[in-house]
């Protein structure tokens, strides 16, 4: 049974005579008259088992003491620490010449843990041990201070175990403590890689290369390696591991980010506080969830604050110029916390009678500089229809607008384009033809471009070729032209007029009056 004694973490004790309870029971040769196991009291009045010999009277002493078998435990080099007291030969009058002040240390490798006898020729000498300090007498109080400590190492070892032996050649000596240990580089964590307990190499200059394994919740950046030096110290760390996303290094471990913190990538960074307008409710967050009403764009880094769509643009002003409209506005009061704001223009053409019945303006309308993705706060819209109700919506958008269904980011204005000269009348018809008259009817222009104030009918005899013509004006979309000559070809043109002026004449309608007093109904442009 051994008691616990504290030694450096890089030393593994194979034998400690001070920790043995009861007798050590090592083998002495000769059995009597040489080394003797003696219990002495330490400074705390605790018994210590020592081996003593003080055969200083006779020459040619050869007293051997052998330990029990010591397992090697895979070590290739072991260290022997001997604490001993050696009496100065000068304190023993009359023994000069026979008294010595050294002893010899030996070892013998063996797979047999039950060897009963000491065979001196099997043992290999490690060293002759001399005292740094020897003294005449030692009292119990001083003894601990005056102990000599010598450490020797031996290797490479290859068998399962070994025996140590101490040869006395005539000294007055007490072995107070014998400790045998090997050195290891103790389990350690460096750069987030764990390196296992590693026994040092066979010789005092060897380095053992050891590959580390990443600690929990981490991954290799570069292959982690270290070298275990002969003194049990780790040397030259190479490579490292990085804490996984959602984890940070704390006390050599990768620990989950605390609530309210996150880490997006495997880096050596620490967890960061959730950006503004976001939160995490679990430990180990790799990103933070946006607050209600806040969003993160696809290409936003996890470190960016959550943002929201902008509010509506402000101060929308319209300027109508005939069939063009210039719109200007101010930036929204709230940009949602983003810089990537832009504007989209929506054009709707609405009926005069029922403004709710609007439909898209279509592709005929043109926008300068563009309809969507405007970076400026103005746009010019052209190729509108004259005298038409339009509603223009200016939408403020940013990188997260698409996530928000609420249409509160637009401002709208309804305008009516100015009146313009109407377009030409597409179809003029002769409804009745007599000897002296022609009844005409026509459709409203495709684009009245305002309120049609009147229609103007220009006609002339074909032979005159417009050198002499007459004008008839009417507010209606039909008229009777009277006082014509029978059996004569006439050409008719119709145009409409708004407050903005006349439109173009229609294509000519050629009609020939009858010779008989009967009525001829015509529907073509060239009734005869």
């Amino acid at each position: 049974v051994t008691g616990s004694r504290v030694y450096p973490a890089n030393e593994v004790t194979l034998l400690d005579s001070r920790s043995v309870q009861g007798e050590l029971g090592w083998i002495a040769s000769p059995l009597e008259g040489g080394w003797e196991e003696v219990s002495i009291m330490d400074e705390k009045n605790t018994p210590i088992r020592t081996y003593q010999v003080c055969n200083v009277m006779e020459p040619s002493q050869n007293n051997w003491l052998r330990t029990d078998w010591i397992t090697r435990e895979g070590a290739q080099r072991v260290y022997i620490e001997i604490k001993f007291t050696l009496r100065d030969c000068n304190s023993l009058p009359g023994v000069m010449g026979t008294c010595k002040e050294t002893f010899n240390l030996y070892y013998y490798e063996s797979d047999n843990d039950k060897e009963r006898f000491i065979r001196e020729n099997q043992f290999v000498k490690i060293d002759t041990i001399a005292a740094d300090e020897s003294f005449t007498q030692v009292d119990i109080g001083d003894r601990i201070m005056k102990l000599n400590t010598e450490i020797r190492d031996v290797g490479p070892l290859s068998k399962k175990g070994f025996y140590l032996a101490f040869q006395d050649v005539g000294a007055c000596i007490a072995l107070v403590s014998v400790r045998v240990f090997y050195k290891k580089c103790p389990l350690t964590v460096r750069n987030l890689a764990q390196f296992p307990d590693t026994i040092t190499g066979a010789d005092t200059s060897s380095l053992v290369e050891v590959r580390g394994s990443c600690v929990n919740n981490s991954e290799e950046k570069d292959v982690p390696k270290m070298y275990c030096g002969a003194d049990g110290e780790w040397l030259v760390p190479i490579g490292n591991c990085l804490c996984n996303a959602g984890h940070e290094e704390r006390s050599g471990e990768c620990q989950a980010c605390k609530i309210g913190y996150y880490k997006a990538l495997s880096t050596d960074a620490t967890c960061a506080k959730c950006p503004p307008h976001s939160y995490s409710v679990w430990e180990g967050a790799t990103s933070c969830t946006c607050d209600r009403g806040f969003f993160r764009a696809d290409n936003d880094a996890a470190s960016m604050p959550c943002t929201r769509p902008p509010s509506a643009p402000l101060n929308l002003i319209s300027n109508v110029n005939e069939t063009s409209v210039n719109l200007e506005w101010s930036s929204p009061q709230n940009t949602g916390g983003r810089q990537d704001i832009s504007y989209n223009v929506v054009c709707k053409k609405c009926g005069a009678g029922d403004p709710s019945k609007c439909r898209p303006c279509g592709s005929g309308v043109h926008y300068t500089p563009q309809q969507n993705g405007l970076k400026t706060t103005k746009v010019s819209i052209t190729d509108l229809l004259a005298h038409t109700n339009y509603t223009f919506e200016i939408w403020a958008v940013n990188g997260v607008s698409k996530y928000n269904p609420n249409p509160d980011q637009s401002v709208s204005v309804t305008v009516t384009t100015n009146q313009a000269a109407p377009s030409s009348i597409a179809l003029v018809q002769a409804k009745e033809v007599t000897r002296y008259s022609v009844a005409l009817a026509w459709l409203e222009p495709d684009r009245p471009n305002g309120v049609i104030l009147e229609y103007e009918v220009k006609y002339y005899e074909k032979d005159q070729n417009e050198r002499s013509y007459r004008i008839v004006r009417t507010a209606a979309r039909n008229t009777d032209i009277k006082g014509l000559n029978p059996l004569t070809s006439y050409v008719f043109h119709v145009r409409a007029r708004t407050a903005a002026g006349y439109g173009d004449f229609s294509e000519p309608l050629e009609v020939t009056t009858n010779t008989v007093p009967s009525r001829i109904i015509g529907d073509g442009a060239n009734s005869t």
């Epitope: 003294f135 009292d139 007055c172």
Partner: antibody, heavy 121, light 106 residues
Framework: QVQLLQSGAEVKKPGASVKVPCKAS????????MSWVRQAPGQGLEWMGW????????TYAQGSTGRFVFSLDTSVSTAYLQISSLKAEDTAVYYC??????????????WGQGTLVTVSS | EIVLTQSPATLSVSPGERATLSCRAS??????PAWYQQKPGQAPRLLIY???TRATGIPDRFSASGSGTDFTLTISRVEPEDFAVYYC????????FGQGTKVEIK
């Protein structure tokens, strides 16, 4: 068994000499020093000195006169104490005792039974 | 030379009691003394020597302690066979004994 055997009592006249033998057995005689101690009647112990049984080199107590001589005959494992010019105050039991040297201090671990020397006219 | 003074000269104890014997040196010594027991008509017997080590066959009720100039022999529970005279002995270039303490039955 280790033992030291001393001779029987001696009665001597003042001025005479006496040689007290101490025969050792049960161990290697030359491996341990031999000490001599005397005890006057009703008194305490007085150390007289010791002899290196290997070399024959003696060590005498401080203040010891030249009347005390330690000697050996290793062939018969015997140590001797010779006292010359005996005085009445030399009357005592004389003990031989084997010396035990240790690194932490010395003691006399085996004692003879003692030889009473009486000096009387 | 160093003089050892033992006290008390006589110590009266009952069997089973603890006995404490003192040995004082005239000057500081660097070693604990040896202790001997002597019964009437017998040679002394070594009890304790260097570093408070009990000699062969000495029961563990005997123990020694102290340093410098003051030393103590303790008999933890006195047995009938322990009634005797006890001597301390200092070793060095010249060995000296104390004058002895007699332990008697109370």
């Amino acid at each position: 068994q280790v033992q030291l055997l001393q001779s029987g009592a001696e009665v001597k006249k003042p001025g005479a000499s006496v040689k007290v033998p101490c025969k050792a057995s049960g161990y290697t005689f030359t491996s341990r020093a031999m000490s001599w101690v005397r005890q006057a009647p009703g008194q305490g112990l007085e150390w007289m000195g010791w002899i290196n049984t290997n070399t024959g080199n003696p060590t005498y107590a401080q203040g010891s006169t030249g009347r005390f001589v330690f000697s050996l005959d290793t062939s018969v494992s015997t140590a001797y104490l010779q006292i010359s010019s005996l005085k009445a105050e030399d009357t005592a039991v004389y003990y031989c005792a084997r010396v035990r040297f240790t690194v932490y201090g010395d003691g006399m671990d085996v004692w003879g039974q003692g030889t009473l020397v009486t000096v009387s006219s | 030379e160093i003089v050892l003074t033992q006290s008390p000269a006589t110590l009266s104890v009952s069997p089973g009691e603890r006995a404490t014997l003192s040995c004082r040196a005239s000057q500081s010594v660097s070693s604990n003394p040896a202790w001997y027991q002597q019964k009437p008509g017998q040679a002394p017997r070594l009890l304790i020597y260097g570093a408070s080590t009990r000699a062969t066959g000495i029961p563990d009720r005997f123990s020694a302690s102290g340093s410098g100039t003051d030393f103590t022999l303790t008999i933890s529970r006195v047995e009938p066979e322990d009634f005797a005279v006890y001597y301390c002995q200092q070793y060095g270039p010249s060995w000296t004994f104390g004058q002895g303490t007699k332990v008697e039955i109370k």
